[in-house]
């Protein structure tokens, strides 16, 4: 239904607190360099304006679209060109082109320092002095570093952050309470960020149809008792919500997400038996709970999929006359039977089915041609199953850090042209798949591993797109989203790469490494490992093990020495010489 004032409508629906949070996220995602104070001033102005429109929808400018109102605010910022360069050119455009222009200037890897968590006491003091400002800073800092973070979900994480601080800041040992809890929130939020980026990439590159297919598969796995018409309705709604958030329409997105949660809770009987616990929660928690809901039990009496999609004489008629609906039904039926498959795999199977019908329905005897299609799925299913098996075995053998290093070597060999920081980040994230997925029951491993890897590889593609350096990476990233992971897995050592010359300074370390937190120490070592591989792409596992073992001993020895600086200065060159020799 149309509203006289869009902004008043959203303010009333969302309430002041969520409205302000979402406006802050929107501004922080568009203008990622602006300080919090500048954004919060704009948020307050927008909120005050929204309140005037709530009081009188006919007031001046209240009929303007939210994009127009937000864009005008951003474009009125003094020194916009000084701070943002060509982004300021967007301001010369009219809506909707202006918003499109802002979206194109979102930076997935902004030049911002890593977010440093303050020390526990200081954190509690500033939280207790002004919780609203403290949580506002959290939204701002996360949103500017992750310009595609799913806004209503970020509000949920801010709520979690609030809960942790409220609980832990009354404890005597604040740090012991805060650290593990905030680490857990951070870990979940970072995974949420890469997953959402993948959804926005899907929407941007392949459009709504591709995203809706993803949603149909996911919903069918979760709600196998829901009928196809119900799944289609949910998938259509989820597609609309994600399109809005990816497009910067955060108020509409959050409002529609709350509406969808309401609908699902009102229609549990036709969706899933597992929803009740979620439906008793407040809005943000309810939506989050529904998004993470466990799979409903598969109906006991599902017939073979062959009866509908292989044995029926009308297969080609359905394919010819109602292609999307027929393929959607196939995806629904296959997905509801296979919660143990990744969404990527299910979409590959649907694509294979589509290609088979495209070919067979043009032939003389279609049923004979497509009669073996289900058997032809077997290699497509075996490939990711083998990937999970071999990688989880390797993870169990090496542990997380060792597994990350193995992945780092593998990916540096595949794409040595990619910058070392990008390779290290990707390998660390890819390596976490072990901890995240390999400990799960067998039936949950494949979907966990493959869908997580796909999201991490999407991040690699997004960063690589900004400065393309590897033809192989470009090739894998340019293809279909669901083929990316198999494409990367199939890459071998890049034979075209001319090894980097050995630079001693790359492997020169100082005593400052000793005081670094464990994570930073690991990153330093992994940076050195990537550089070694770039120097010797064909180094054997044993050679790399020797050099890295030697390096670890060197760091350990010098960090324990009385005169650390002297140790690093004298032992360092010896290490470099030994390493060169070991790799010769």
């Amino acid at each position: 239904e149309a509203h006289k004032s869009e902004i008043a409508h959203r303010f009333k629906d969302l309430g002041e607190q969520h409205f302000k949070g979402l406006v802050l996220i929107a501004f922080s995602q568009y203008l990622q360099k602006c300080p919090y104070e500048e954004h919060i001033k704009l948020v307050q102005e927008v909120t005050d304006f929204a309140k005037t429109c709530v009081a009188d929808e006919n007031a001046e400018n209240c009929d303007k679209s939210i994009h127009t109102l937000f864009g005008d605010k951003l474009c009125a910022i003094p020194k916009l060109r000084d701070n943002y360069g060509e982004l300021a050119d967007c301001c010369a455009k009219q809506e909707p082109e202006r918003n499109e222009c802002f979206l194109q200037h979102k930076d997935d890897n902004p030049n911002l320092p890593p977010f440093q968590r303050p020390e526990a006491e200081a954190m509690c003091t500033s939280f207790q002095e002004n919780p609203t400002s403290f949580l506002g800073h959290y939204l701002h800092e996360v949103a500017r570093r992750h310009p595609y973070f799913y806004a209503p979900e970020l509000l949920y994480y801010a709520e979690k952050y609030n809960e942790v601080l409220t609980q832990c800041c009354t404890e005597s040992d604040k740090a012991a309470c805060l650290t593990p809890k905030l680490d857990a929130v951070k870990e979940k939020a970072l995974v949420a960020a890469v997953r959402q980026r993948m959804k926005c990439s899907s929407m941007q590159r392949f459009g709504e149809r591709a995203f809706k297919a993803w949603a149909v598969a996911r919903m069918s796995q979760r709600f196998p008792n829901a009928e196809f018409a119900e799944i289609t309705k949910l998938a259509t709604d989820v597609t609309k919500i994600n399109k809005e958030c990816c497009h910067g329409d955060l108020l509409e997105c959050a409002d529609d997400r709350a509406e969808l949660a309401k609908y699902m809770c009102e229609n549990q009987a036709t969706i899933s038996s597992k929803l009740q616990a979620c439906c008793d929660k407040p809005v943000l928690q309810k939506s989050q709970c529904l998004a993470e809901i466990e799979h409903d039990n598969i109906p006991a009496d599902l017939p073979s999929i062959a009866a509908d999609f292989v044995e029926d004489k009308e297969v080609c008629k359905n394919y010819a006359e109602a292609k999307d609906v027929f393929l959607g039904t196939f995806l629904y039926e296959y997905s509801r039977r296979h919660p143990d498959y990744s969404v990527s795999l299910l979409l590959r199977l649907a694509k294979k089915y589509e290609a088979t019908l495209e070919k067979c329905c043009a032939e003389g005897d279609p049923p004979a041609c497509y009669g073996t299609v289900l058997a032809e799925f077997q290699p497509l299913v075996e490939e990711p199953k083998n990937l999970v098996k071999t990688n989880c075995e390797l993870y169990e053998k090496l542990g997380e850090y060792g597994f990350q290093n193995a992945v780092l070597v593998r990916y540096t060999q595949k794409a040595p042209q990619v910058s070392t920081p990008t390779l290290v980040e990707a390998a660390r994230n890819l390596g976490r798949v072990g901890t995240k997925c390999c400990t799960l029951p067998e039936a949950q491993r494949l979907p966990c591993v493959e869908d997580y890897l796909s999201a991490i590889l999407n991040r690699l593609c997004v960063l690589h797109e900004k400065t393309p350096v590897s033809e192989k990476v470009t090739k894998c990233c340019s293809g279909s989203l669901v083929e990316r992971r198999p494409c990367f897995s199939a890459l071998t050592v890049d034979e075209t790469y001319v090894p980097k010359e050995f630079k001693a300074e790359t492997f020169t370390f100082h005593s400052d490494i000793c005081t670094l937190p464990d994570k930073e120490k690991q990153i330093k070592k992994q940076t050195a490992l990537a550089e070694l591989v770039k120097h010797k792409p064909k180094a054997t596992e044993d050679q790399l093990k020797t050099v890295m073992g030697d390096f670890a001993q060197f760091v350990d020895k010098c960090c324990k020495a009385a005169d650390k600086d002297n140790c690093f200065a004298t032992e360092g060159p010896n290490l470099v010489a030994r390493s060169k020799e070991a790799l010769a």
Partner: nanobody
Framework: EVQLLESGGGLVQPGGSLRLSCAAS????????VAWFRQAPGKEREFVAG????????YYADSVKGRFTISRDNSKNTLYLQMNSLRPEDTAVYYC???????????????????WGQGTLVTVSS
């Protein structure tokens, strides 16, 4: 729950016409494919015709092509089967059947259809 109720059967002479109706009550009926099956005495139920839900697509058994026409009126939640040029071999109990939430007829195997009307008898005889 899906409820289907057929009407319009009766006695008709060879070459004559009949129009069967099937009234449906179900939330997603306009998005669901519905089929007509028939069962002659001592024979298996066989597929006669079907129509897509939300999709303009119709299906017919070879034996009725060109003589029978299936249609639907979503505003009335009703499915129709217009039967012309009737023959004695068309004599049977005609049933309306649905597979919930399925927009297409992807199978004509009667066992896959969970919802059926009680049937209406059509007798073609002189």
């Amino acid at each position: 729950e899906v409820q289907l109720l057929e009407s319009g059967g009766g006695l008709v002479q060879p070459g004559g016409s009949l129009r069967l109706s099937c009234a449906a009550s179900y939330r997603y009926i306009d998005e669901t494919a519905v089929a007509w099956f028939r069962q002659a005495p001592g024979k298996e139920r066989e597929f006669v015709a079907g129509i897509g839900g939300g999709v303009d697509i119709t299906y017919y058994a070879d034996s009725v092509k060109g003589r029978f026409t299936i249609s639907r009126d979503n505003s009335k939640n009703t499915l129709y089967l217009q039967m012309n040029s009737l023959r004695p071999e068309d004599t049977a109990v005609y049933y309306c059947a649905a597979r919930p939430g399925r927009p297409l007829i992807t199978s004509k195997v009667a066992d896959l259809y969970p919802y059926w009307g009680q049937g209406t008898l059509v007798t073609v005889s002189s």
